[in-house]
């Protein structure tokens, strides 16, 4: 049993490194903002017994504008740097572990293809011919300027770009 | 089609720094967020960090104070830069154009570079 995709939260970001159950994962603020006192950035994808269904806990995370950072002149569109934001010290911290590292699941990535649009984001669709994953464009409301700039770029997933002895961890919905 | 290269792995002492960089290539090079990733011979893959992009970052504890990502959309380049290194930082180090499930939900894709050899030893 896997977990499907986490909820998205406003101005903050996860990188999702396995959808296993009880994976613990962390929201990250984006630049500019910060992790509101008194909320927490973690979720954990737990099983809920009556509906034998996975799902992610939903995080109490608020990310609001930095003060520290408002009055900043923005960096140049053409380059990101990483200064400004430093996750805060959370009273549930993660164990440590980094269970994408633990156990390889099934690879389910293979048939995904991903289209990365300028100023968008991506969302999944089941097609219905195959069952398989796609993506398609979707509005962000959190696209920098350097990505409404950029060119296209296209992924199409396919297993022979896996580094040898590496099993991405894929993700499945529910059952 | 896109293609990802790493550079930078090298041999270097207890203590020292490395730059990776990774560079994309292909039709463009829009990405909403890159991962890091190593591998040593015989172990699972561990994941290192990532750079989100508005630029935040998030870092596995046992880099958390001393890896730092950035990336430069110019040069279409992504770096992870090392310090304080460790033996236990030994490893081919790959980077990872993620795909984006949700809004600000990114996962790894199936698209990853060739690897760069890291060597930490005296």
């Known amino acids: 049993i896997t977990c499907p995709p986490p909820m998205s939260v406003e101005h903050a970001d996860i990188w999702v490194k396995s959808y296993s159950l009880y994976s613990r994962e962390r929201y990250i603020c984006n630049s500019g903002f910060k992790r509101k006192a008194g909320t927490s950035s973690l979720t954990e994808c737990v099983l809920n017994k009556a509906t034998n269904v996975a799902h992610w806990t939903t995080p109490s995370l608020k990310c609001i504008r930095d003060p520290a950072l408002v009055h900043q002149r923005p960096a140049p569109p053409s380059t990101v740097t990483t200064a400004g934001v430093t996750p805060q010290p959370e009273s549930l911290s993660p164990s440590g572990k980094e269970p994408a590292a633990s156990s390889p699941s099934s690879n389910n990535t293979a048939a995904t293809t991903a289209a990365i649009v300028p100023g968008s984001q991506l969302m999944p669709s089941k097609s219905p011919s195959t069952g398989t994953t796609e993506i398609s464009s979707h509005e962000s409301s959190h696209g920098t300027p350097s990505q409404t700039t950029a060119k296209n770029w296209e992924l199409t997933a396919s297993a022979s770009h896996q580094p040898p002895g590496v099993y991405p961890q894929g993700h499945s919905d529910t059952t | 089609e896109v293609q990802l290269v790493e550079s930078g792995g090298g041999l270097v002492q207890p203590g020292g720094s490395l730059r990776l960089s990774c560079v994309g290539s292909g039709d463009g090079f829009s990405i909403s967020a890159v991962g890091w990733y190593r591998q040593t011979p015989g172990k699972q893959r561990e994941w290192v960090g990532v750079?989100?992009?508005?630029?935040?970052?998030d870092y596995a504890d046992s880099v958390k104070g001393r890896f730092t990502i950035s990336r430069d959309n110019a040069k279409n380049t992504v770096y992870l830069q090392m310090n304080s290194l460790k033996p236990e930082d030994t490893a081919v180090y790959y980077c990872?154009?993620?795909?984006?499930?949700?809004?600000?939900?990114?996962?790894?894709?199936?698209?990853w570079g060739q690897g760069t050899q890291v060597t930490v030893s005296s």
């Open positions: 990872n154009a993620g795909v984006t499930t949700n809004r600000g939900v990114h996962r790894e894709s199936n698209y």
């Open positions: 750079i989100f992009s508005s630029g935040s970052t």
